[in-house]
Amino acid sequence: QQQTLPKPFIWAEPHFMVPKEKQVTICCQGNYGAVEYQLHFEGSLFAVDRPKPPERINKVQFYIPDMNSRMAGQYSCIYRVGELWSEPSNLLDLVVTEMYDTPTLSVHPGPEVISGEKVTFYCRLDTATSMFLLLKEGRSSHVQRGYGKVQAEFPLGPVTTAHRGTYRCFGSYNNHAWSFPSEPVKLLVTGDIENTSLAPEDPTFPADTWGTYLLTTETGLQKDHALWDHTAQNLLR
């Protein structure tokens, strides 16, 4: 006899990276018929929702109106059907951004490179941080960690057209508190003509929608959205 129900999916909308003082919604998708959902933060019960009517709802939302460093951390959720509880969801790392300062990002040898060349991004932030994150905008949620007293190096390559796109970096004050994003650097890779059609550029965001950072969801499928979030977060860990 089954002792637990399948684990729910957890994700954040619009994204798990939330600028301070902005709103975010944590979504938990379980099964129809679930009578109770619990959201846990850093291992402790944080919020409870009891959907009505349970047989017509398989997803609940926990709204955070004003993101701050105290709300940043690891979230998970569980749900209950009758007396039977589910397995806990995967962990959702909710990150607060736009803390303190803005790093600078430069790329060597430059923003326009030739396929096959090796590329290094440099991220610098003078305030007290030793961890840096380089993120490539677009659906595939590329995240790299780097370490250094005031700056970190992020080697890429040899590059192909798949590396084309817009990059930003953050300084990380802890795992869940990041700086403002750097100004974007758009990497253009030329000279790999025969492979161009095999490696289309990731969709990028207009400058004013960087709030959504890495994610685009065209399908509207919540499970896909959750999986993209987990991809990025697993890379972060």
């Epitope: 600078t104 990002l105 430069s106 060597h108 040898p109 430059g110 030739i114 396929s115 096959g116 060349e117 090796k118 290094t120 440099y122 610098r124 700056q151 190096e153 080697p155 390559g157 040899p158 590059v159 000279g191």
Partner: antibody, heavy 115, light 107 residues
Framework: QVQLQQPGSVLVRPGASVKLSCKAS????????MHWAKQRPGQGLEWIGH????????NYNEKFKGKATLTVDTSSSTAYVDLSSLTSEDSAVYYC????????WGAGTTVTVSS | DIQMTQSPSSLSASLGERVSLTCRAS??????LNWLQQEPDGTIKRLIY???SLDSGVPKRFSGSRSGSDYSLTISSLESEDFVDYYC?????????FGGGTKLEIK
Amino acid sequence: QVQLQQPGSVLVRPGASVKLSCKASGYTFTSSWMHWAKQRPGQGLEWIGHIHPNSGISNYNEKFKGKATLTVDTSSSTAYVDLSSLTSEDSAVYYCARGGRFDDWGAGTTVTVSS
Amino acid sequence: DIQMTQSPSSLSASLGERVSLTCRASQDIGSSLNWLQQEPDGTIKRLIYATSSLDSGVPKRFSGSRSGSDYSLTISSLESEDFVDYYCLQYASSPWTFGGGTKLEIK
């Protein structure tokens, strides 16, 4: 066209410091890396470090940390390398080079360390 | 650090001759390699970047190629002004490093 102007030569005493300049023109100074390299008489080239004028990001060859400090003055489109505690080992030609791929080179400054 | 082993260190050749200089990289550098020319007065000019791309204004007799970790500069037909020093330079991984140089002399 791109020009990187460096003083021809400089004579300095042992133990002193010297600041070498590289005045750039013919391109947008803040958009390209500036490298510095050293060449002792009759020897090959050694990379000292580079700096990006726009971001201030700099990176050094471990061998030259504590010896060389790179700075820029964007208002005059000039890059500098500061060499400290000079000895005869620092007597060499010092070159600046523009761009991540070392696209263009200055004519070099000959530094002679002698008492 | 990546070592760039350049050979030969000196080479005697005749006008009109075809010559090749080689640099071997101790680690993968992709196509991040330049060839530089240095005149007796110290003037340095880049000839080739990204392994095989010819700089504008550089004569077509110069060409660059790669085979595995070996990078070559070929001069198809030597002219009198070519008898100077040549260096390779990798810009793949910091610290960027130069080969030891090749002195090309007229026979």
